[in-house]
């Protein structure tokens, strides 16, 4: 069970890191291209990973102004890195009934980042709940 628990920890750490990166980007929201991006909200159960991939695919861009361009670009790149896979994630990938990215409401960068953070928090909570109930599925 040790490697299973280490895998769960790795997944949890990665999700938590993504929240920190989102928080970092929120400090530079005025230096992002003010483009409207698909921002899933109130994501239906079992479509979290689908919504997550919509956030990762979105074209968040630096406005290339000032000295913050490098940190913004690195942060955006890190947001797009694939997190460790989980059984729940693998199962969800096979679902064809989740909304397409284009069907989600488009929002400016500030709201986009806030919604991304909310989804990540929801996913952490679900992950913890499944651990509590003895499932190794998380």
């Amino acid at each position: 069970h040790k490697s299973s628990s280490q895998g769960q920890d790795r997944h949890m750490i990665r999700m938590r890191q993504l929240i920190d990166i989102v928080d970092q980007l929120k400090n530079y929201v005025n230096d992002l291209v003010p483009e409207f991006l698909p921002a899933p909200e109130d994501v239906e159960t079992n479509c979290e990973w689908s919504a997550f991939s919509c956030f990762q695919k979105a074209q968040l861009k630096s406005a290339n102004t000032g000295n913050n361009e490098r940190i913004i670009n690195v942060s955006i790149k890190k947001l797009k890195r694939k997190p460790p896979s989980t059984n729940a994630g693998r199962r969800q990938k096979h679902r064809l009934t989740c909304p397409s990215c284009d069907s989600y409401e488009k929002k400016p960068p500030k709201e986009f980042l806030e919604r991304f953070k909310s989804l990540l928090q929801k996913m952490i909570h679900q992950h913890l709940s499944s651990r509590t109930h003895g499932s190794e599925d998380s």
């Epitope: 938590r16 920190d20 942060s75 913890l128």
Partner: antibody, heavy 117, light 106 residues
Framework: QVQLVQSGAEVKKPGASVKVSCKAS????????MHWVRQAPGQGLEWMGL????????IYNQKFKGRVTMTRDTSTSTVYMELSSLRSEDTAVYYC??????????WGQGTLVYVSS | DIQMTQSPSSLSASVGDRVTITCRAS??????LNWYQQKPGKAPKLLIY???RLHSGVPSRFSGSGSGTDFTLTISSLQPEDFATYYC????????FGGGTKVEIK
């Protein structure tokens, strides 16, 4: 077992810089980010920032931005925290703490930095 | 920035007492709260994470509860080794610690 061993106490003059090290062992160094936290004498804990040990990505507490630099050396599994333009208020014990799943799960023993003219 | 306020800042209690420490966040932090214990001259140690989950090796007399802005750390029956300072810490947005609560011997 996980261990974080920090460098020894430092005495510095106002305006100088200090570089504190934290050597990690007992786990895969680049799998875990690292936090730095400080504690002034008789005071509470203050979060300074964190570093991604795999690629030196950093997130700093705005309060220390411009004065703090966090780096790492993967060959020795060591992270560093450098604080510049020191003032007497920077006298504190500085801790490194491992970025666990949802908390700072392991801490170094602390490094006292004393700033005095 | 999210501010964390702990109360009381210190308390006196006897071995066997039930002790309750509270922590209030300046905004909703959901369950993103941890508790640490620190003894004089030592580094802090993680006790409870995500409001109510016991870190490995922590005795079950420690428990945490709360949600949103108000949180509680309870020691059901104080032991000699529990005399220390306790800190809450939010991790909803970056990290902030409370001012600490010192638990002293009565």
């Amino acid at each position: 077992q996980v261990q974080l061993v920090q460098s020894g106490a430092e005495v510095k003059k106002p305006g100088a810089s200090v570089k504190v090290s934290c050597k990690a062992s007992g786990y895969t160094f680049t799998d875990y980010w690292m936090h730095w936290v400080r504690q002034a004498p008789g005071q509470g804990l203050e979060w300074m920032g964190l570093i991604d040990t795999s690629d030196v990505y950093t997130i700093y507490n705005q309060k220390f931005k411009g004065r703090v630099t966090m780096t790492r050396d993967t060959s020795t599994s060591t992270v560093y925290m450098e604080l510049s333009s020191l003032r007497s208020e920077d006298t504190a014990v500085y801790y490194c703490a491992r970025y666990g799943p949802l908390a700072m799960d392991y801490w170094g023993q602390g490094t006292l930095v004393y700033v005095s003219s | 920035d999210i501010q964390m306020t702990q109360s009381p800042s210190s308390l006196s209690a006897s071995v066997g007492d039930r002790v309750t420490i509270t922590c209030r966040a300046s905004q909703d932090i959901s369950n993103y709260l941890n508790w640490y214990q620190q003894k004089p001259g030592k580094a802090p140690k993680l006790l409870i994470y995500y409001t109510s989950r016991l870190h490995s090796g922590v005795p079950s007399r420690f428990s945490g509860s709360g949600s949103g802005t108000d949180f509680t750390l309870t020691i059901s029956s104080l032991q000699p080794e529990d005399f220390a300072t306790y800190y809450c810490q939010q991790f909803h947005t970056l990290r902030t610690f409370g001012g600490g609560t010192k638990v002293e011997i009565k």
